[in-house]
């Protein structure tokens, strides 16, 4: 089930999703100037199965003067340069996506794509946070984020991070106190469901990530 | 909870415009599409356009292009459909929904064109 | 733009039906094939999204298929509360287009 919102935004701080669950939607958004051609798809979509899971559709832009064009090719280097993702661009890739059943690699980059990718998330799809460059990361926790299901309702779990300049101290001012979990309360709290597919394996991954994500200084 | 809600009905006169806003609340403005559709009484639905209000990026309806104007105001997370040049045809219930499979849809206003 | 056409503009069925809602497209759509529920007061809500997925908060008694050009919904079980018209739309391409409503009564 798709998540109704997006991840929490840590100040100064990016997420990504290592990879994307089967049901993950991408918008097809193109930058300025640019549009989709006519009849492009207005989204791609993670499907398959567990064992095989790839993006459904493909995006395609075309100049808004020119609206039949339909060619479909890399971006130059300084093309793919210019994007911005709500993705970290981690310097190594650290868990091979394709490792990872029932979920999809990052779709590949298509011209003329908007400066941001907008994915909308499904239920049990994890993401992780990084500092980004010039701040350093106060860990509490986990510094990642799941959507669950509960109540019938999806919510997105609290990441355990803080992103701090260099120069500061470690205490914000007004800083709230540290959390007792990742929730923002204890799960003994609440006695409802809590859906929490893939949980396993994707933690597991998550150990395999931490120390080369979140010991790499972001260059 | 994810809510949609549209200003009230309005009553117009032939030639006239209409402007009517659609509040977001519950989720992230900027990180959903909204979309208004059409639905003339006893009849099916009308897909007008959309807009990203993240980057004001539209798209609309060819029938609709010189009808209706959308835009959006982050700071309110509201939208705004403005349709123009008013006529009986244009008397009709539209709804804004929002997001890329469009998930969630507002109640709907009434747009009554009369002389 | 794409056509989308539900040939059965009512149905009456009873408590406790298995119905089945038909639509079809003027092309292919790649099963990017959506169904909503519209009640009386105007109401509209996603049923079902890319031809099968179930939309959170939907009951599971609602279920989707079809691929290519032809799709289809179906309610397993029939209740009151399901009394309204359904709506197909593709989603495939812009402009979105919908079917013509299936309205579902009671006999």
């Known amino acids: 089930e798709l998540c109704d919102d997006d991840p929490p935004e840590i100040p100064h701080a990016t997420f990504k999703a290592m990879a994307y669950k089967e049901g993950t939607m991408l918008n097809c958004e193109c930058k300025r100037g640019f549009r989709r051609i006519k009849s492009g798809s207005l989204y791609m979509l993670c499907t398959g199965n567990s064992s095989h899971s790839s993006w459904d559709n493909q995006c395609q832009c075309t100049s808004s003067a020119t609206r039949n064009t339909t060619k479909q090719v890399t971006p130059q280097p300084e093309e793919q340069k210019e994007r911005k993702t709500t993705e970290m661009q981690s310097p190594m890739q650290p868990v091979d996506q394709a490792s990872l059943p029932g979920h999809c690699r990052e779709p590949p980059p298509w011209e003329n794509e908007a400066t941001e990718r907008i994915y909308h998330f499904v239920v049990g799809q994890m993401v992780y946070y990084q500092c980004v460059q010039g701040y350093r990361a106060l860990h509490r926790g986990p510094a990642e984020s799941v959507c669950k299901m509960t109540h019938g309702k999806t919510r997105w779990t609290q990441p355990q991070l803080i992103c701090t300049g260099e120069m500061e101290t470690s205490q914000f001012p007004g800083e709230e106190k540290p959390q007792a979990s990742p929730e923002g309360r204890p799960e003994s709290e609440t006695s409802c469901l809590v859906t929490t597919t893939d949980f396993q394996i994707q933690t597991e991954m998550a150990a395999t990530m931490e120390t080369s994500i979140f010991t790499t200084e972001y260059q | 909870d994810v809510q949609l809600q549209e200003s009230g009905a309005e009553l117009a006169k032939p030639g006239a415009s209409v402007k009517m806003s659609c509040k977001a609340s519950?989720?992230?403005?900027?990180?959903?599409?909204m979309h208004w559709v059409k639905q003339r009484p006893g009849q099916g639905l009308e897909w007008i356009g959309y807009i990203n209000p993240s980057t004001d990026y539209t798209e609309y309806n060819q029938k609709f292009k010189d009808k209706a104007t959308l835009t959006a105001d982050k700071s309110s997370s509201t939208a705004y459909m403005q349709l123009s040049s008013l006529t009986s045809e244009d008397s009709a219930v539209y709804y804004c929904?929002?997001?890329?499979?469009?998930?969630?849809w507002g109640q709907g206003a009434t747009v009554t064109v009369s002389s | 733009d794409i056509q989308m056409t539900q040939t059965t503009s009512s149905l009456s069925a009873s408590l406790g039906d298995r119905v089945t809602i038909s639509c079809r497209a003027s092309?292919?759509?790649?099963?990017?094939l959506n169904w909503y529920q519209q009640k009386s007061d105007g109401t509209v809500k996603l049923l079902i999204y890319?031809?099968?997925r179930l939309h959170s908060g939907v009951p599971s008694r609602f279920s989707g298929s079809g691929s290519g050009t032809d799709y289809s919904l179906t309610i397993s079980n029939l209740e009151q509360e399901d009394i309204a018209t359904y709506f197909c739309?593709?989603?495939?391409?812009?402009?979105?287009?919908f079917g013509g409503g299936t309205k579902l009564e009671m006999k």
């Open positions: 739309q593709q989603g495939n391409t812009l402009p979105p287009t």
């Open positions: 092309q292919d759509i790649s099963n990017y």
């Open positions: 890319y031809t099968s």
């Open positions: 519950g989720y992230t403005f900027t990180r959903f599409w």
């Open positions: 929904a929002r997001g890329t499979v469009v998930d969630y």
